[in-house]
Interface confidence: medium
């Protein structure tokens, strides 16, 4: 004779207040004949949740039609879940008995617990920008989840990070929990377009983790490189000098020209271009009038990037006698 098995597949069922919980129970045999009842808890104080033979259970419905003789599914749904519904639920097979039906076999039980989804992770970067090769910290926070078990991972451009510390609070029993994690990220020069992702996995999310992101563009400062060059061709009695500011981020930039230490306001033209890695190039042209110049003209291109200390590059202008003559000739 086959032994009847009561199968309750879920050890833990997480439910949300106000929703409907489905408690699964199937049997492997219909013999001995008798009803299946649902209880919360064990022992003499257990609470009857559902009896297929009799009683009124307004919040409970059956998944299958229990009046069908071949039914082996005794799963139930409990509607409008409240915190008072938490506990361990047992489906129990009774055999016909007297003076009452006799308990024959119980399922292993399903613990119903209130589950709360974590809030969307919020990722905050450093307050100030930092240059490449340095380490910056990012924090990720998520709140309001239950139960306490939760998994948090960090990624940079899809690659998992390992240098982080995570805390879940409180440490004891609570209705809901919070997680805070701090990751240390070494900045690379090309990180303007990079992202850090905080990924939170929780049983209530059914395998669909929540993600919070931060752009490293908010945390990185790529300082510019400067190059000042004199163009070989002249325009009339003027020489074109170019200041190329390369590979900087963010875009915030102030450029000034000085002629022998005197700040000039006459920048001729400039162009801003964006590189593939998200950094910028700035080119500024400065026309120097050489008709009456001495030989010792020094031009300085000074750049103040993102509120940092100014950097500059100097160029001693080379003006040949031939150029001077040509200049003189061109003067009206």
């Amino acid at each position: 004779e086959e032994e009847l098995q009561m199968i309750q597949p879920e050890k833990l069922l997480l439910v949300t207040v106000g929703k409907t919980a489905t408690l699964h129970c199937t049997v492997t045999s219909l013999l001995p004949v008798g009803p299946v009842l649902w209880f919360r808890g064990v022992g003499p104080g257990r609470e009857l949740i559902y009896n297929q033979k009799e009683g009124h259970f307004p919040r409970v419905t059956t998944v299958s039609d229990l009046t069908k003789r071949n039914n082996m599914d005794f799963s139930i749904r409990i509607s409008s879940i409240t915190p008072a519904d938490v506990g361990t639920y047992y489906c129990v097979k009774f055999r016909k008995g007297s003076p009452d039906d006799v308990e024959f076999k119980s399922g292993p039980g399903t613990e119903m617990a209130l589950g709360a989804k974590p809030s969307a992770p919020v990722v905050l970067g450093p307050a100030a920008r930092t240059t490449p090769e340095h380490t910056v910290s990012f924090t990720c926070e998520s709140h309001g989840f239950s139960p306490r078990d939760i998994t948090l991972k960090w990624f940079k451009n899809g690659n998992e990070l390992s240098d982080f510390q995570t805390n879940v609070d409180p440490t004891g029993q609570s209705v809901a929990y919070s997680i805070r994690s701090t990751a240390r990220v070494v900045l690379d020069p090309w990180d303007v377009r990079s992202q850090v992702i905080c990924e939170v996995a929780h049983v209530t999310l059914q395998g669909d983790p929540l993600r919070g992101t931060a752009n490293l563009s908010e945390a990185i400062r790529v300082p510019p490189t400067l190059e000042v060059t004199q163009q070989p061709m002249r325009v009339g009695n003027q020489v074109n000098v170019t200041c190329q500011v390369r590979k900087f981020y963010p875009q915030s930039l102030q450029l000034t020209w000085s002629e022998n230490g005197n700040v000039c306001q006459r920048e001729t033209a400039s162009t801003l271009t964006e590189n593939k890695d998200g950094t910028y190039n700035w080119t500024s042209w400065f026309l120097v009038n050489i008709s009456d110049q001495r030989d010792d003209v020094v031009l300085t291109c000074q750049v103040k990037h993102d509120g940092q200390l100014a950097v500059s590059k100097r160029l001693a202008l080379e003006v040949t006698v031939h150029q001077k003559d040509q200049s003189s000739d061109a003067t009206p």
Epitope: E1, E2, L4, T28, S29, L30, L31, P32, V33, G34, P35, T67, K68, R69, N70, M72, R95, K96, G97, S98, P99, D100, D101
Partner: antibody
Framework: EVQLVESGGGLVQPGGSLRLSCAAS????????MHWVRQATGKGLEWVSV???????YYPGSVKGRFTISRENAKNSLYLQMNSLRVGDTAVYYC????????????WGQGTMVTVSS | DIQMTQSPSSLSASIGDKVTITCRAS??????LAWFQQKPGKAPKSLIY???SLQSGVPSKFSGSGSGTDFTLTISSLQPEDFATYYC?????????FGQGTKLEIK
């Protein structure tokens, strides 16, 4: 019409074997527990075995280990394989349907006679 | 095993009579009791289940009562077709067992 028809009875020597069949019609056979009940001539009724919807089986001590109940839902058929037969197994064998949720018999076949004699 | 005892073993009655057959279980069987009618050379016919529930198609002159160990079958107004042997059966636990039968004869 709901109907059960037994067959396969006959005369067999002690120690011999016999297989009874019960053909069901007019209802969804696979949805019911099925029983065999026997009645010796001039005597009362004796329950012989049950097979549940899932194929689980029970027997009284008098036939346990000698009789095997089985079912073939695709053929709407119930069987009773009787081995090591004894003179005391002589009886009319009825198949019956466990009809209500609590397995009370509601439909009976007309019976088939099994005689065990040397 | 649960023993089922019927009384009387036989009973003579006239057409139109009201008769009562009793069945006693050797232990409490709740209300898991059935009654059957059997005529000579025929298969048993189901009359009552769960002590008092009438099987479909059974006339209301048949009624059952009782719970625990003592049960009764009452036939309110005997007709010729009611003369037969009546069996009670417990089906609370395996092996299911029957009473020895009550033979109802015409007086």
């Amino acid at each position: 019409e709901v109907q059960l028809v037994e067959s396969g009875g006959g005369l067999v020597q002690p120690g011999g074997s016999l297989r009874l069949s019960c053909a069901a019609s007019g209802f969804t056979f696979s949805s019911y527990d099925m029983h065999w009940v026997r009645q010796a001539t001039g005597k009362g009724l004796e329950w012989v075995s049950v097979i549940g919807i899932a194929g689980d089986t029970y027997y009284p001590g008098s036939v346990k280990g000698r009789f095997t109940i089985s079912r073939e839902n695709a053929k709407n058929s119930l069987y009773l394989q009787m081995n090591s037969l004894r003179v005391g197994d002589t009886a009319v064998y009825y198949c019956a349907r466990g009809g209500s949720w609590d397995d009370a018999f509601d439909i009976w076949g007309q019976g088939t006679m099994v005689t065990v004699s040397s | 095993d649960i023993q089922m005892t019927q009384s009387p073993s036989s009973l003579s009655a006239s057409i139109g009579d009201k008769v009562t057959i009793t069945c006693r279980a050797s232990q409490d069987i709740n209300n898991y009791l059935a009654w059957f009618q059997q005529k000579p050379g025929k298969a048993p016919k189901s009359l009552i289940y769960t002590a008092s529930s009438l099987q479909s198609g059974v006339p209301s002159k048949f009624s059952g009562s009782g719970s625990g160990t003592d049960f009764t079958l009452t036939i309110s107004s005997l007709q010729p077709e009611d003369f037969a042997t009546y069996y009670c059966q417990q089906y609370v636990s395996y092996p299911y067992t029957f009473g020895q039968g009550t033979k109802l004869e015409i007086k």
